[in-house]
Amino acid sequence: SGPVKELVGSVGGAVTFPLKSKVKQVDSIVWTFNTTPLVTIQPEGGTIIVTQNRNRERVDFPDGGYSLKLSKLKKNDSGIYYVGIYSSSLQQPSTQEYVLHVYEHLSKPKVTMGLQSNKNGTCVTNLTCCMEHGEEDVIYTWKALGQAANESHNGSILPISWRWGESDMTFICVARNPVSRNFSSPILARKLCEGAADDPDSSMV
């Protein structure tokens, strides 16, 4: 029995729960998901029983090995998986636990602009990046392009201070999760600040 293995998958994709055993006579292998039986295998008997019929088409054993491949992943496949290898030659079953996190492929992040001030020819505001559907475990970074050196900023909020007359800048939000990344539409400082000069209230981008 080894330490818990953490696995990551994407919606619609597949994940393989690695399992090896050198036991000669395996009587049965039982896979469970959040305490619900998932698959029971009897290698000597040659039988594989998938508890829920709808999972039959999603279960596979690559190269005829003990590892379990689960495909057509859904968000609610996230959870704890547990396998027990039972054998008369073992005093106790050999066990392994896995934690699966299933993530969605990220859509385009949305950017909103906070309250803005225009003082002494400097446009000051915040840009906030977020996912419309509230996806989990998203990390945001901002890329600021166009000055002498391109800059990066971590976090969903980007404070902006841009002086009229400076070379224009482009801001792009990058949203990442463990299985994908996506980019916001580019935002030009000049356009942003022109709009804000006309309308001092907050606006959407």
Epitope: K22, K24, I41, P43, E44, G45, G46, I48, G64, Y66
Partner: antibody, heavy 120, light 108 residues
Framework: QVQLVQSGAEVKKPGASVKVSCKAS????????MNWVRQAPGQGLEWIGR????????KYNGKFKGKATLTADKSTSTAYMELSSLRSEDTAVYYC?????????????WGQGTLVTVSS | DIQMTQSPSSLSASVGDRVTITCKAS??????VAWYQQKPGKAPKLLIY???YRYTGVPDRFTGSGSGTDFTLTISSLQPEDFATYYC??????????FGGGTKVEIK
């Protein structure tokens, strides 16, 4: 990658013995069952027996008890099948084949076959 | 020993045809049936194990089904490389494992 390489063709006289080898590579030889299957010319497949190289445990088809002897050498990852008291009806292609782990009676990798001809 | 009766022993078909081969066990073997493809002068190749599990790399036009005593191998759309002999095999519990007599799939 998994490979099973068998020894070359043999021609034997009736009453003689023959030993066919099967060298395995690309997987844990000791912990997978190795099967032997024969195919007479123009005929179907017949399971002879299997051996677990880890401890030398062998299981035989009753029809081949006393005819075939299965052994394995872990140090060289080689399985052997010896056929004794050969008769003309033993003329066949003999295959070694590895068992899958998930269903030990199903065989996923096969050697290229060894033709044993018994003729006076 | 468990007998495996395979039918037909041969069939003629054209590329694109749907082909079905059946295998009947002389006693209940649960879902412990494998299917192999063999071409002349070559070793058999595992297609299906445990009645319906496609082995890695086997095209999805090959489908296995059945349980108990009646089993089927279906090729949904026959391809030129599928012309070969097919064998069923029971791999239930204690050996000996036994094979069907084979089905030769020929070009019509």
């Amino acid at each position: 990658q998994v490979q099973l390489v068998q020894s070359g063709a043999e021609v034997k006289k009736p009453g003689a013995s023959v030993k066919v080898s099967c060298k395995a590579s690309g997987y844990a030889f000791s912990s997978s069952w190795m099967n032997w299957v024969r195919q007479a010319p123009g005929q179907g497949l017949e399971w002879i027996g299997r051996i677990y190289p880890g401890d030398g445990d062998a299981k035989y088809n009753g029809k081949f008890k006393g005819k075939a002897t299965l052994t394995a050498d872990k140090s060289t990852s080689t399985a052997y099948m010896e056929l004794s008291s050969l008769r003309s009806e033993d003329t066949a292609v003999y295959y070694c084949a590895r068992s899958t782990m998930i269903a030990t009676g199903a065989m996923d990798y096969w050697g290229q076959g060894t033709l044993v001809t018994v003729s006076s | 020993d468990i007998q495996m009766t395979q039918s037909p022993s041969s069939l003629s078909a054209s590329v694109g045809d749907r082909v079905t081969i059946t295998c009947k066990a002389s006693q209940d073997v649960s879902t412990a049936v494998a299917w192999y493809q063999q071409k002349p002068g070559k070793a058999p190749k595992l297609l299906i194990y445990s009645a319906s599990y496609r082995y890695t790399g086997v095209p999805d036009r090959f489908t296995g089904s059945g349980s108990g005593t009646d089993f089927t191998l279906t090729i949904s759309s026959l391809q030129p490389e599928d012309f070969a002999t097919y064998y069923c095999q029971q791999h239930y519990s204690t050996p000996p494992y036994t094979f069907g007599g084979g089905t030769k799939v020929e070009i019509k």
